[in-house]
Interface confidence: low
């Protein structure tokens, strides 16, 4: 079953996916696509790497993390309810039947009046992120609102992989990662 | 708009450490990446490495064994040490911003680095 | 590591002729990932085009970039006298970051 994460309306939404490339610069494409992962490739890509860099993104779909060292979590940015819904992260290892598939299901909930929880807050403190909409429309900046709920039961045990960067760390234990080579 | 500000010695030992800091203003420095590019008198640019904001590093092969790029989110700034200099080290020092989409977008001024005795 | 070689080293042109700028890559570059920068002396480089063919915020529809692969063309299609500077190309897909050396574009 799929790992649930949860965003309220207006806030950024972070799916979590990551993988430990074979060495510095040898990228492994990656796509994200709304709808679980079908046999091949993703469906509905939203967003999209190749062996060097990100080749495609759509207007509120960003990856925020060090995408060349294998952090290729997704954010989106000021999520409506109609975002809801299971997400593909494909990492597409070369070989036939390689790609690991993540499936994440987002579920977004109605903005609420109160305060975030502490824990939300105190990650956003400590990792604040841009999201620059250029290419898109005027520059605008937010900072990522929500962290996931996590069932720690569904972690994947390759994240300790993820060395090079400490944001890929502190977030190691709510991504799916895999190590490539 | 985004603008950056190079500071340090001008003047560096040889052996010593050659030590720079950017800050960024106009803007956060948590957004991709923040990179060093050095270039000697009269010739072209040499990429040092770059930074993430999150501390993640990638460093030119060439110069590697000797640089380290940190960041300071709390100041929105990132800083360069280049140990165990020598004269070949002498260049002007610029630092840049690096979208990774977009390429190096916003540049400093730059400043002048000489490693002399 | 990608090796950019950069010709003509120096182009001697009159104000308001073309200039045609060349940069060739010791391997394929994914267009998207290549860059042009302008430098004039004293000052840092100021970007002018990324994704081989994109123009940056501000710059004049005079420059246009062209290319794919290993061959990367920058053209100024009437130089203004504010136009005569070095310019640099640069890949920034590929580990380590690579610029070539240089084509001045200088007064005739």
């Known amino acids: 079953s799929e790992v649930e994460y949860r965003a309220e309306v207006g806030q950024n939404a972070y799916l979590p996916c990551f993988y430990t490339p074979a060495a510095p610069g040898n990228l492994v494409p990656v796509c994200w696509g709304k709808g679980a992962c079908p046999v091949f490739e993703c469906g509905n890509v939203v967003l999209r790497t190749d062996e060097r860099d990100v080749n495609y993104w759509t207007s509120r779909y960003w990856l925020n993390g060090d995408f060349r060292k294998g952090d290729v979590s997704l954010t989106i940015e000021n999520v409506t309810l109609a975002d809801s819904g299971i997400y593909c992260c494909r990492i597409q290892i070369p070989g036939i039947m390689n790609d690991e598939k993540f499936n994440l299901k987002l579920v977004i909930k109605p903005a609420k009046v109160t305060p975030a929880p502490t824990r939300q807050r105190d990650f956003t403190a400590a990792f604040p992120r841009m999201l620059t909409t250029r290419g898109h429309g005027p520059a605008e900046t937010q900072t990522l609102g929500s962290l996931p709920d996590i069932n720690l039961t569904q972690i994947s045990t390759l994240a300790n992989e993820l060395r090079d960067s400490r944001l890929a760390n502190d977030l190691r234990d709510s991504g799916a990662t895999i190590r490539i080579g | 708009q985004v603008q950056l500000q190079e500071s340090g010695p001008g003047l560096v030992k040889p052996s010593e450490t050659l030590s720079l800091t950017c800050t960024v203003s106009?803007?956060?420095?948590?957004?991709?990446?923040w990179s060093w590019i050095r270039q000697p008198p009269g010739k072209g640019l040499e990429w040092i490495g770059y930074i993430h904001y999150t501390g993640s590093t990638n460093y030119n092969p060439s110069l590697k064994s000797r640089v380290t790029i940190s960041v300071d989110t709390s100041k929105n700034q990132f800083s360069l040490k280049l140990s165990s200099v020598t004269a070949a080290d002498t260049a002007v020092y610029y630092c840049?911003?690096?979208?990774?989409?977009?390429?190096?977008?916003?540049w400093g001024q730059g400043t002048t680095v000489t490693v002399s005795s | 590591e990608i090796v950019l070689t950069q010709s003509p080293g120096t182009l001697s042109l009159s104000p308001g002729e073309r200039a045609t700028l060349s940069c060739r890559a010791s391997q394929s570059v994914s267009s998207s990932y290549l860059a042009w920068y302008q430098q004039k002396p004293g000052q840092a480089p100021r970007l002018l085009i990324y994704?081989?063919?994109s123009r940056a915020t501000g710059i004049p529809d005079r420059f246009s970039g062209s290319g794919s692969g290993t061959d990367f063309t920058l053209t100024i299609s009437r130089l203004e006298p504010e136009d005569f500077a070095v310019y640099y190309c640069q890949q920034y897909g590929s580990s380590p970051l690579t610029f070539g050396g240089g084509t001045k574009v200088e007064i005739k």
């Open positions: 106009g803007g956060s420095i948590s957004r991709y990446y």
């Open positions: 840049a911003t690096d979208t990774g989409y977009y390429g190096m977008d916003v």
């Open positions: 994704g081989a063919s």
